[in-house]
């Protein structure tokens, strides 16, 4: 057949759906690859064709749209499963074509099983709540387009295995789950099960997300440099190893980039000729406040190196700070015999 623009297998869109639940999968062509939408394509006389390759097979085959109860159907640019089966797992291709134009993309679809507490191989979205910040809500995700607004679904919320009812600070409110005051104990996986009727059948959508309680912006401060500080002097003799830690505390800030860097005589270490190495380690508190440590190391320090200015810098969305390390050359201890002799006036 004639040439087709093949976007290949789009592994960025690894779609995971639960077994025995409805799934609606939009053709990625219109979302990520083409400059026009399905309606434009359709009105221009282009046809959208679907086919698939089963798991562990090489053979592309058409999708069977004549299954009982229309289990698999296509509506505009959406492929519908009502519901999925485990063996629907495979690579799906949508192809847009007419006699003169052709474009296609494949994507992997994985039908996964959940256990009795909703655990599964599915990658979970993470929703961050600020600690002790007042009422905050999470919303049952990815349920748009499954049923019309005239249908009133039943929603049941769970934390882990347990239905959420009579919880102190967590209240189910339909599609939303309200946290009156988020605490560390609210960390965990939350699942909404949405039940809705369609054409004489009942369907369920299971959606799980991870809640992580993080530091509140009310308590956020600019970076705090714990080390170097005024109490510690790095006194070295030439030839010794110089190790200076820069330890910085960063309050959690949503979407903030935390940075730590050293300057030596006002320059980045990469821009000077001395043999310096910097090792970084990062640790987090339970509320995702961050402590970064960068250890500046010079294996064999020279007397010139001990005269330089070593400054630790830190920056976050809350501000920028800097602190110089106190570095000096160790004064050699006096040689006892000579001093003694001098003291007695010996020549």
């Amino acid at each position: 057949s004639e040439r087709c623009d093949d976007w290949g297998l789009d592994t960025m869109r690894q779609i995971q759906v639960f077994e025995d639940e409805p799934a609606r999968i939009k053709c990625p062509l219109f979302e990520h690859f083409l400059k026009f939408n399905y309606s434009t394509a359709h009105s221009a006389g282009l046809t959208l064709i679907w086919y698939w390759t089963r798991q562990d097979r090489d053979l592309e085959e058409p999708i069977n749209f004549r299954l009982p109860e229309n289990r698999i159907s296509k509506e505009k640019d959406v492929l519908w499963f009502r519901p999925t089966l485990l063996n629907d797992t495979g690579n799906y291709t949508c192809m847009l074509r007419n006699t003169t134009y052709c474009s296609k993309v494949a994507f992997p679809l994985e039908v996964v099983q959940k256990d009795s507490c909703f655990n599964s191989p599915m990658k979970l979205p993470v929703h961050k709540l600020y600690i002790e910040y007042g009422i905050q809500r999470i919303t049952c995700p990815n349920v748009d387009g499954y049923f019309p607004s005239s249908v009133k679904p039943t929603i049941t919320w769970y934390m882990g295995c347990y239905k959420i009812q009579n919880f102190n600070n967590v209240i189910p409110e339909g599609m939303n789950l309200s946290f009156l005051i988020a605490l560390i104990s609210n960390n965990g996986n939350y699942t909404c099960v949405v039940t809705y009727p369609e054409n004489g059948r009942t369907f369920h959508l299971t959606r799980t997300l991870t809640v992580k309680v993080v530091g509140s912006p009310k308590n956020a401060v600019p970076p705090v440099i714990h080390s170097p500080n005024d109490h510690v002097v790095y006194e070295k003799e030439p030839g010794e190893e110089l190790l200076i830690p820069c330890t910085v505390y960063f309050s959690f800030l949503m979407d903030s980039r935390n940075e730590v860097w050293w300057t030596i005589d006002g320059k980045k270490p990469d821009d000077i000729t001395i043999d310096v190495t910097i090792n970084e380690s990062i640790s987090h508190s339970r509320t995702e406040d961050e402590t970064r440590t960068q250890i500046l190391s010079i294996k064999k320090v020279t007397s010139e190196d001990l005269k330089r200015s070593y400054v630790c810098h830190a920056r976050s969305a809350k501000g920028e700070v800097a602190k110089a390390a106190k570095v000096k050359q160790k004064v050699p201890a006096p040689r006892y015999t000579v001093e003694l002799a001098c003291g007695f006036g010996a020549t």
């Epitope: 077994e19 025995d20 519901p83 485990l86 959940k114 009795s116 099960v193 039940t195 369920h204």
Partner: antibody, heavy 119, light 107 residues
Framework: QVQLQQSGPELVKPGASVKISCKAS????????MNWVKQRPGKGLEWIGR????????NYYGEFKGKATLTADKSSSTAYMQLNSLTSEDSAVYFC????????????WGQGTLVTVSA | DIQMTQTTSSLSASLGDRVTISCSAS??????LNWYQQKPDGSVKLLIY???TLHSGVPSRFSGSGSGTDYSLTISNLEPEDIATYYC?????????FGGGTKLEIK
């Protein structure tokens, strides 16, 4: 089309055991809880317990712990209930019933299996 | 365990009547209540889940209501095929428990 097909009636002696089956078809057997319900002649419904075939997790109503054992075979999409140390109190119709999804309402019911305990 | 009580064990009504069957829980069950119909042949069918949601295919003459500990099932226009025993069931807390049932007969 979801179906739950239960095994036939059983006549068993006191003290013996019986294992009844419920074969499921038309849905993802591993991904729904299967419940068992007891109904003594002329009486109401009593929930015995449930099993999640996907991971074998079970919950039992207190009085049925030790009396009933729930298992499931994913390869044949069949749930089983074994009743031990049978007495006349265990003479009843036993239903399997599938949760539709996770919430605990029972949309699909088997036709029931009559167990009669008699010497 | 939560006790479910259906105070009326049997009820007699005429065709076309409006019939209400009540059910009470020993503690609040947050609307986590279902209703089932068991026909004389022993077959069981879900009618209503989550207090008031009509299950697919169930005639609209059936409706459910209630909150807290008190719930009811109403049949607005009794038909011959409604002759059955009706059970409420809570799924607020394990173990799930059923009411004792209300048998509905025609006068």
């Amino acid at each position: 089309q979801v179906q739950l097909q239960q095994s036939g009636p059983e006549l068993v002696k006191p003290g013996a055991s019986v294992k009844i089956s419920c074969k499921a078809s038309g849905y993802g057997f591993s991904s729904s809880w299967m419940n068992w319900v007891k109904q003594r002649p002329g009486k109401g419904l009593e929930w015995i317990g449930r099993i999640y075939p996907g991971d074998g997790n079970t919950n039992y109503y207190g009085e049925f712990k030790g009396k009933a054992t729930l298992t499931a075979d994913k390869s044949s999409s069949t749930a089983y209930m074994q009743l031990n140390s049978l007495t006349s109190e265990d003479s009843a119709v036993y239903f399997c019933a599938r949760n539709d999804g996770y919430p605990a309402w029972f949309t699909y019911w088997g036709q029931g299996t009559l167990v009669t305990v008699s010497a | 365990d939560i006790q479910m009580t259906q105070t009326t064990s049997s009820l007699s009504a005429s065709l076309g009547d409006r019939v209400t069957i009540s059910c009470s829980a020993s503690q609040g069950i947050s609307n986590y209540l279902n209703w089932y119909q068991q026909k004389p042949d022993g077959s069981v069918k879900l009618l209503i889940y989550y207090t008031s949601t009509l299950h697919s295919g169930v005639p609209s003459r059936f409706s459910g209501s209630g909150s807290g500990t008190d719930y009811s099932l109403t049949i607005s226009n009794l038909e011959p095929e409604d002759i059955a025993t009706y059970y409420c069931q809570q799924y607020s807390y394990l173990p799930w428990t059923f009411g004792g049932g209300t048998k509905l007969e025609i006068k």
